[in-house]
Structure formats: structure tokens, C-alpha cells
């Protein structure tokens, strides 16, 4: 299936040009998306091209400037947040990145009724997190690991917690491992729907071992960065959940929410919190051995001013074939009765589907079914449930939006997006206004991305929000590679792959092949999305064929494929890449003497193991910021898939699956190892150990470190990285510079 055919014809060839590396590094062909910042059923805010914050009213068709670019510029604001009562806006400036999601910033409050900044009782700086209540204009914020509350922006703050301490106790914000591997947010506090209560997590990292690495900076002596970071098998953070009444915060103070007994009996995690009503909250907990999850619905007891979590409102989700959930355990979407909910989990056939839980999980009503997976529940209204899945035409790498009418019996299903722009758009996400009165669809490809606005009742398209016209015009004289998504059937396993082919691809010729791999559990690389990136350039200009393969362990094709890697990381992911390469060679257009593999992070691990597989298939390869031993990586992630590194659990496979154990096998390949020295995620330690093992085995290899760079290798390092990797590959493939 050719998804992005080249527009090259002989008559046009003179005017067309190939992509250059400079195009990629400059972001010349980047696209824009439009996500409305919904503030009601029919209104959204958006930052205009000239940086005004503009309100759009869909019903009247009119626009209104609510915050001028001058006001934004006066405090160098890079972000804003409107209070729900529309009286105030917070302006965020001095953004300072911490980890993947977390950052600190300075906040100013602007009064929209008088057009002035609020003076008196200003916020301290820098703040770790700040948010408005869902109703009115109360403020909750985290400063120096403690939570504060303001009834109004100009009021003095009320301090909720007092035990916050850097790297020790975190209130309202996650520690490193919860941020990266469990919550995937910078915050750990949640307002109740009407702002009566504020729930928050407290993470105690006192006993967690610390990772320490040098940050070289510009000073005479390097700084040492210390992060409490639990590696596999190490002591984990201790989590507690508290709820405080924000109307009378001093009255009884924070009340702890009890942990279900079956969870509290051994090490556990808190995985998410969902408010149902102002007086009902749903907490999800997970055993440290992550195959048992408990969803606990708790109610406020007015008489005792406490939270009660009856056993009858505990719902257990257990996996017997792998870990609980996909990458994370899914979160519930409650219906209007405030007790029943919709949730995605595995059905009896091992496919993740939407279920409706009214009393017990055992009696759950399955809402979707088939040999495909429901991926996300976007919104549940009185009469409709909107979700995404990869059902359409049996392509796992697509995403379409569906509506199920839950107000009628039997429920009817409609694909909202399947036939909208079928060639251009096969991978969607959506953003809904209040009560799903309107919604935006954001199409990511395979054609040029487009964002559109729709009526939530009729699904009618109202207007195009962003169609990337400039990008379309810029690409008109570019020789883009061809892309195809197909599948290989091997030993009852379906291996979906994406192949990126040079513009003038000729099946009768031989091309060098580069495998790009990620391959981590519950990931997906073969997606019907638009991208003009480094591998596009390698195909367009350098004439390489690039392939991405989703093997065992990858997502959205059922539990059999997903859980195949359970407790055995580093085996089947590598096997499947190798199997695919052999199939590609059989196709006849691959030069089998010029095959390379590269990957980043988990992909660096897989590429390293593939290079060291002893197959002789790969001439060369690159590992960027690879994991080299699962004993070096975070507990929450690693143990989910590998269990514990103990003798009575899975220590043997922890030891067998290291890159270092295969050092000898690198002798016959060209290996480029790359890592940032300030990688807080996959520590430089991983590459240091690979390098040490290779040196000890007297194996030659190439390496590049990026001083003070983290897992993302951003900024100027990106340019250096891709330039360096390009030279390496061209040398490996004997391509002239």
C-alpha cells in the first residue's frame, strides 16, 4: 500500500530536489496542529500568530482578544491559564525544564476585569506547579515541595503541607520515577469537580538510593546532580494520598485516603486519581509486582470528615499472562450515575476493549470487541461514547475516532473519521468541548496533517483550523521518499512494517537497508503518520531503504504479541527484527552486504543486541542512549516487564539480557555508541559499562558522548548527533560524501 506516493515525473525532475540534512535539522518541513483550549461548550482560546490570546465563539462566529501580546510580553510570558470564572489569567514565564514533564516557572496573575496585574500577596518564585480550581478562581500551587492554597489570587496563601523537602518529601508533585514511569505528569494534585476538595499525593523518597552524576557546566568544579532514583529491585518511594477541604482548610486538615488491604500487604504504587463528584473519588493502586491493580471508589463521610473506601467498591484487575494494562493501567471514565464507569482492559480473547462496569468487574459488559484494540476513551456524554481504535481495515497503525450511542438499545457504532479524508488521514486524535458540543479532530497523516472543527451532534465539519498550506507548498518541489505499510506472516506472528523507499525506487536494483528500531513493550513504530525527518532524508538524498518493524512486545495487536516479552526482555524483540531483515533480503532489492540498524533508548538496547546477535546480517549500527542492563533502569518500568532481579524471581534473565554479556560478538560489526553525560533517565552508566566491556574484550568501536546533555540530546547536540550518524552510515554503506 503506497501511502505517500512521490510526485516525481520525468518532466518535473529538473525542478524537484531531494531532501537535505539541513532541511531536517532546520525543521523546514515541520507541521502545525491546532488543539483548541476549550473554555466552554462553544468557546475556545488560541494564541494567534501575533501572540494575542484570542477567544473564539463557534456559535456566533466571532473572535475576541482577551489578552494582548503586549501584556504577554510585559512579563515575557510563554504560557497562560484562564480561571474558570474568567476573572483572572495566570501568565507563566522563566520556564526552566527539570525532567520530562516537570519544570519550574514564575507566575503573574492578571485581572481581566480591570486590565491590571494583581498586586499584593504575589506568588513566590520559582513555582513547581500551579493550577486554578475547576470553578471560580482558587489557586493551588507547589513551592519548595509544599502545597499552598489561595481562595482568591490577591489573598494570602494557606499552607497545606509543611514536610516538603528537596529530594526527600514531595507534596503535590511526583518524584522522578512517578513522573516518568507512572503518572506521566508534572503534578500530583487533583481538584474535585467543583473545587470543594483538593486531593494530593505525598511521595517519601527518604530511603531511595540516589543516582549521582557530574554536570560540567562552566565552573572550575563540576556540579553533582543527585536524584533519588530506584533501579530495579531497589527501595521504592512510599506514597500516601490526602484530601483537604479547600473551603475550610484549617478545620480538620488533610485526611489520608486508606489503601486497599490487598494492596497494602506488600510494596505498592498509586497509579492515578479520578474525581467522580465533589464527594466521591476513585483511586487506582498497583502491587509492586505489577499484575494486580485495584480500583477503589471512596466516599466522603460528612459526620467524621473522612474518606471511606468500602471493599464493595474495590474492583480488581489482574493479568495472568503479563502485566496489568498496556503501558499503564487504563483509567476509568465515569458515567452520569457517578458509580458505573467505562474502562479499557483485556477481553477473554486477549484484546484490549471498552467494558462497562456497573457493579463488579466480573459482570462487566463488553462494549467493543474484535481482533483489534480500543485505544482511548475521549468522552462519555449522556448519549454517546467517543473512543479511538485501530479497527478500520485491520491496520494496527491507524487511529480512527468512533461514536457509540449509549442512550439507545442496542448501542450503535459509527466511525466518525474513517471516510473523511481517507487517503490523507488515517491517524487521528480528538479534543472535545464541554458536553462534547463541538470537537476538534487532529489528523497526523499519512498525508500532510490537518486539524478541523466539528459539530458534536451531527459530526459535520464546521471549519478547517489548520491545514499546513505553507508546508504543502514547500513540499511541492521536494522528492519525498515513498512509504508503504505492509505485513509479514512468520510462524503465526504478524510483523507489521513500514518501508521508506528512495523517490526513484527501482525493484530491480539493490539498496542499502537501515533498520530503525524502538521495540519497547507496548510501543508502536509502524504508524500511518506524516513525517519528514532524518530517515526521510536518508531515503530521499542518500538512496537508502529504511524499515521499521513492530515485533513481539509491541502494542495494539492483542495480548499474545504484547505479553510475549514478559520476563524475557531482549529476546523476541531482537529475533523479530532479524527475521524481518531476512524477509526484506528475500524481496530482492536489498544489498545484503550493506545492512545497518539504529535505535535510541530501548531502541539502542535492541540495536546493540541485534548487532551482537552473531547472525552476520548487520555491517554496522548505532545505539543512542541505550539501556545496557535492566539492573540499571528504573524499578517501575523494568519490574513491570521483568519482575525482580532476585534469585527466586528473575535474576538469571536480568544477567543474560545485558549488552555487556555479548561484548565479544561486536568484533565483526562497526558499532557507534552515543550517550549524553547528564542523562537522568537512561544513565550514562549504561554506555560506560558497554564501553568497558568492549575495551576488556579488546573490541574496537566508535563512541560519542554529549557533555551535560540528557536523554533527548537537544539543541546544538541534535545537529551534531545527526551529522555524526550520517557520516557513520555513509561510510558504512560506502556512499560518497
Amino acid at each position: 500500500i503506497v501511502l505517500r506516493p512521490s510526485r516525481v515525473h520525468n518532466s518535473e525532475e529538473n525542478t524537484m530536489r531531494a531532501l537535505t540534512l539541513k532541511d531536517i535539522l532546520n525543521g523546514t518541513f515541520s507541521y502545525k496542529t491546532f488543539f483548541p483550549n476549550w473554555i466552554s461548550g462553544q468557546e475556545y482560546l488560541h494564541q494567534s500568530a501575533d501572540n494575542n490570546i484570542v477567544l473564539y465563539n463557534i456559535e456566533t462566529g466571532q473572535s475576541y482578544t482577551i489578552l494582548s501580546n503586549r501584556t504577554m510580553k510585559s512579563v515575557n510570558a510563554s504560557n497562560y491559564g484562564l480561571s474558570p470564572d474568567r476573572q483572572f489569567v495566570y501568565l507563566e514565564s522563566d520556564y526552566s525544564k527539570l525532567w520530562r514533564y516537570s519544570y519550574t516557572a514564575t507566575y503573574y496573575i492578571y485581572d481581566l476585569s480591570n486590565g491590571e496585574f494583581v498586586r499584593g500577596n504575589e506568588l513566590p518564585r520559582p513555582i513547581q506547579y500551579l493550577c486554578w480550581s475547576p470553578v471560580g478562581s482558587k489557586l493551588a500551587y507547589v513551592y519548595q515541595n509544599n502545597i499552598y492554597l489561595k481562595q482568591r489570587p490577591g489573598d494570602p496563601p494557606f499552607q497545606i503541607t509543611f514536610n516538603g523537602r528537596e529530594n526527600k518529601i514531595f507534596n503535590g508533585i511526583p518524584d522522578w520515577v512517578y513522573e516518568e514511569e507512572m503518572l506521566a505528569t508534572k503534578y500530583a494534585l487533583w481538584w474535585s469537580p467543583n473545587g470543594k476538595f483538593l486531593a494530593y499525593a505525598e511521595f517519601n523518597d527518604t530511603d531511595i538510593p540516589v543516582i549521582a552524576y557530574s554536570y560540567y557546566g562552566d565552573e572550575q568544579y563540576p556540579r553533582t546532580i543527585n536524584i533519588p532514583y530506584p533501579k530495579a529491585g531497589a527501595k521504592n518511594p512510599v506514597v500516601r494520598i490526602f484530601i483537604i477541604d479547600t473551603t475550610y482548610p484549617a478545620y480538620v486538615g488533610p485526611q489520608e485516603v486508606p489503601v486497599p488491604a490487598m494492596i497494602a500487604s506488600s510494596d505498592y504504587y498509586f497509579s492515578w486519581l479520578t474525581w467522580v463528584t465533589d464527594e466521591r473519588v476513585c483511586l487506582q493502586w498497583l502491587k509492586r509486582v505489577q499484575n494486580v491493580s485495584v480500583l477503589s471508589i471512596c466516599d466522603f463521610r460528612e459526620d467524621w470528615q473522612t474518606w471511606d473506601c468500602p471493599k464493595t467498591q474495590e474492583h480488581i484487575e489482574e493479568s495472568r499472562t503479563g502485566w496489568a494494562g498496556g503501558f499503564f493501567v487504563s483509567t476509568p471514565v465515569f458515567s452520569y450515575d457517578a458509580i458505573s464507569y467505562y474502562k479499557i482492559f483485556s477481553d477473554k480473547d486477549g484484546y484490549k476493549h471498552i467494558h462497562y462496569i456497573k457493579d463488579t468487574v466480573e459482570n462487566a459488559i463488553q462494549i467493543t470487541s474484535g481482533k483489534w484494540e480500543a485505544i482511548n476513551i475521549f468522552r462519555v456524554t449522556q448519549d454517546s461514547l467517543f473512543y479511538s481504535s485501530n479497527e478500520f481495515e485491520e491496520y494496527p497503525g491507524r487511529r480512527n475516532i468512533y461514536r457509540i450511542s449509549i442512550g439507545s438499545y442496542p448501542p450503535s457504532k459509527k466511525c466518525v473519521t474513517c471516510h473523511l479524508r481517507k487517503e490523507r488521514c488515517q491517524y487521528y486524535t480528538a479534543s472535545f468541548s464541554d458536553y462534547a458540543k463541538y470537537y476538534a479532530l487532529v489528523c497526523y497523516g499519512p498525508g500532510i496533517p490537518i486539524s478541523t472543527l466539528h459539530d458534536g451532534r451531527t459530526d459535520q465539519e464546521i471549519k478547517i483550523l489548520e491545514e499546513n498550506k505553507e508546508l504543502e507548498n514547500a513540499l511541492k518541489n521536494i522528492q519525498l521518499p515513498k512509504e508503504e505499510i505492509k505485513k509479514l506472516e512468520v510462524d503465526e506472528i504478524t510483523l507489521w512494517y513500514k518501508m521508506i523507499l528512495p523517490p526513484q525506487f527501482d525493484r530491480s536494483k539493490k539498496y542499502p537497508l537501515l533498520i530503525q528500531v524502538y521495540g519497547g513493550p507496548c510501543s508502536q513504530s509502524v504508524r500511518s503518520v506524516f513525517a519528514v525527518n532524518w530517515i526521510s532524508y536518508l531515503a530521499s538524498k542518500e538512496g537508502m531503504v529504511i524499515a521499521l518493524v513492530d515485533g513481539r512486545g509491541t502494542a495494539f495487536q492483542g495480548d499474545k504479541l504484547l505479553y510475549a516479552v514478559y520476563r524475557k526482555l531482549g529476546v523476541y524483540e531482537v529475533e523479530d527484527q532479524i527475521t524481518a531483515v531476512r524477509k526484506f533480503i528475500e524481496m530482492g532489492f536489498i544489498d545484503e552486504k550493506r545492512i545497518a540498524i539504529w535505535g535510541w533508548s530501548y531502541g539502542g538496547y535492541v540495536s546493540s543486541l541485534a548487532l551482537a546477535s552473531g547472525t552476520g546480517l548487520f555491517k554496522c549500527g548505532i545505539a543512542v542512549a541505550p539501556v545496557s542492563s535492566w539492573e540499571y533502569y528504573a524499578s517501575v518500568y523494568t519490574e513491570r516487564f521483568m519482575g525482580l532481579p532476585t534469585k527466586d524471581d528473575n535474576l538469571e534473565h536480568y544477567k543474560n539480557s545485558t549488552v555487556m554479556a555479548r561484548a565479544e560478538y561486536f568484533r565483526n560489526v562497526d558499532y557507534l555508541l552515543i550517550h549524553g553525560t547528564a542523562d537522568d533517565n537512561v544513565h550514562f552508566q549504561n554506555s560506560a559499562q558497554i564501553a568497558k566491556a568492549l575495551v576488556n574484550a579488546q573490541v574496537d568501536f566508535q563512541a560519542m558522548w554529549y557533555s551535560d546533555q540528557n536523554h533527548g540530546l537537544s539543541g546544538l547536540s541534535t545537529n551534531h548527533l545527526y551529522t555524526h550518524m550520517t557520516h557513520f552510515l555513509k561510510q558504512c554503506f560506502s556512499l560518497s560524501d
Epitope: Q42, Q62, S63, Y64, I66, G115, D434
Partner: antibody, heavy 119, light 111 residues
Framework: QVQLVQSGAEVKKPGASVKVSCKAS????????MDWVRQAPGQGLEWIGD????????IYNQKFKGRVTMTIDTSTSTVYMELSSLRSEDTAVYYC????????????WGQGTTVTVSS | EIVLTQSPATLSLSPGERATLSCRAS??????????INWFQQKPGQAPRLLIY???NRGSGIPARFSGSGSGTDFTLTISSLEPEDFAVYFC?????????FGGGTKVEIK
């Protein structure tokens, strides 16, 4: 301080057009929409329409559709409202009002322009 | 269009008394928890002046004796203690739906 100064009174014959101006000062014209409201003698208030100064985008009361045109001249910070095909029932005081979009509120008003339509 | 009905048409009160003005909408003017009902004061020969916006928020420089309340279809403007300068005509107005509409007004006169 915010000021909206409107043009002077007009007397027009039925079928003619009138163009009322409103000069804004004390704030940046493009930061707020401008609405027009009229008040017939001894009567209530009637909303005519709204203009978004950044693009000149307008919304009009259906009752005036086809007869009203709102325009803007950012160089002079002036907004105009033209009403055509005048009839006697268009006799009224016409007000320009600054419209604070986030609150959908007309927070400052011009002094009014009396338009008399008489044969 | 949304019709706003104000009552009473005239309110005769003495300075210092409490004034309660009513405004009823022909359909709900609630917009997801916010009601775009505004109140204006108009004195003879003058332009209207914004008193209350969004049902209950006082406009710039408006004294605390003026307050607004209500939701759905029923809204109230209250003047807790009438001052001599408060005797005027009061209009309610909705901005929830185009065309924006005004009530017929309540005249507050000296008894």
C-alpha cells in the same frame, strides 16, 4: 482613561444612509471588540452588531443584516457603523460600546449620536 | 431570540431602602456554569453604564451596594441601600446568544 467619542447628530431622509464614527482613546483599539447599540426615543436598547478589530470580522443582528456595515480604521483608532435604506423607525440614539469579550460585557459607552430620519 | 422581561416596570422607594429588581429570560442563559447577564444603569440624557457583568461581578468603580445574583432564567439586581444618585432606569441584558438582547428596563424613582 478610556474614552469613546462619537460623531455629531445627523438628520437623514428615508432611503438614505448614515455613517456614524466612534474614536477610541485611552486603550489600544485592537484589544477589544466594538459593539453598536441603539435606543429609540423613550424606548429600550437594541443591539446592532459587533466588530473584531484585528481582522474586521463582524456579527450583526439579523434584523439589520444587509443594511448595516461596520468597519475600522486602526490608523486613527476609529470604528464606523453605516446604516443604509433608512426609515423613520431608525430614528434613535446610536451608541458605540467597547465590548470585553471574555465577559461578553459592554464596559464603556460613547456619548451617543442622534440620528433622525425624516422626510 | 431570547426575550428578557424586567419587573416591576417602576419601583418607588426612598433613599436608604433596599431595591430588588427582577429580570426573567425566555430561555436559560446559562453557559456551562456562567450566566452572561449584565446590568446597566441609565440616567436621562446619558449613555448606559455597566454595573454588573456575568450575573454577579461588579463593574469597575461600582459601589458594593450593587449586587447581582441568579441562574438559568431568573436574575436579580439588588441595591442594598439606595443613595440619591441611584434613582435611574436599570436594564438587564443577555450576551449568551446572538442577537444580544436587553430587558425593557425598570425605573427606580423616589417615593
Amino acid at each position: 482613561q478610556v474614552q469613546l467619542v462619537q460623531s455629531g447628530a445627523e438628520v437623514k431622509k428615508p432611503g438614505a444612509s448614515v455613517k456614524v464614527s466612534c474614536k477610541a482613546s485611552g486603550y489600544t483599539l485592537t484589544d477589544y471588540n466594538m459593539d453598536w447599540v441603539r435606543q429609540a426615543p423613550g424606548q429600550g436598547l437594541e443591539w446592532i452588531g459587533d466588530i473584531y478589530p484585528n481582522t474586521g470580522g463582524t456579527i450583526y443582528n439579523q434584523k439589520f443584516k444587509g443594511r448595516v456595515t461596520m468597519t475600522i480604521d486602526t490608523s486613527t483608532s476609529t470604528v464606523y457603523m453605516e446604516l443604509s435604506s433608512l426609515r423613520s423607525e431608525d430614528t434613535a440614539v446610536y451608541y458605540c460600546t467597547r465590548f470585553r469579550g471574555i465577559h461578553y460585557a459592554m464596559d464603556y459607552w460613547g456619548q451617543g449620536t442622534t440620528v433622525t430620519v425624516s422626510s | 431570540e431570547i426575550v428578557l422581561t424586567q419587573s416591576p416596570a417602576t419601583l418607588s422607594l426612598s433613599p436608604g431602602e433596599r431595591a430588588t429588581l427582577s429580570c426573567r429570560a425566555s430561555e436559560s442563559v446559562d453557559n456551562y456554569g456562567l450566566s452572561f447577564i449584565n446590568w446597566f444603569q441609565q440616567k436621562p440624557g446619558q449613555a448606559p453604564r455597566l454595573l454588573i457583568y456575568g450575573t454577579s461581578n461588579r463593574g469597575s468603580g461600582i459601589p458594593a451596594r450593587f449586587s447581582g445574583s441568579g441562574s438559568g432564567t431568573d436574575f436579580t439586581l439588588t441595591i442594598s441601600s439606595l443613595e440619591p444618585e441611584d434613582f435611574a432606569v436599570y436594564f438587564c441584558q443577555q450576551s449568551n446568544e446572538v442577537p444580544y438582547t436587553f430587558g425593557g428596563g425598570t425605573k427606580v424613582e423616589i417615593k
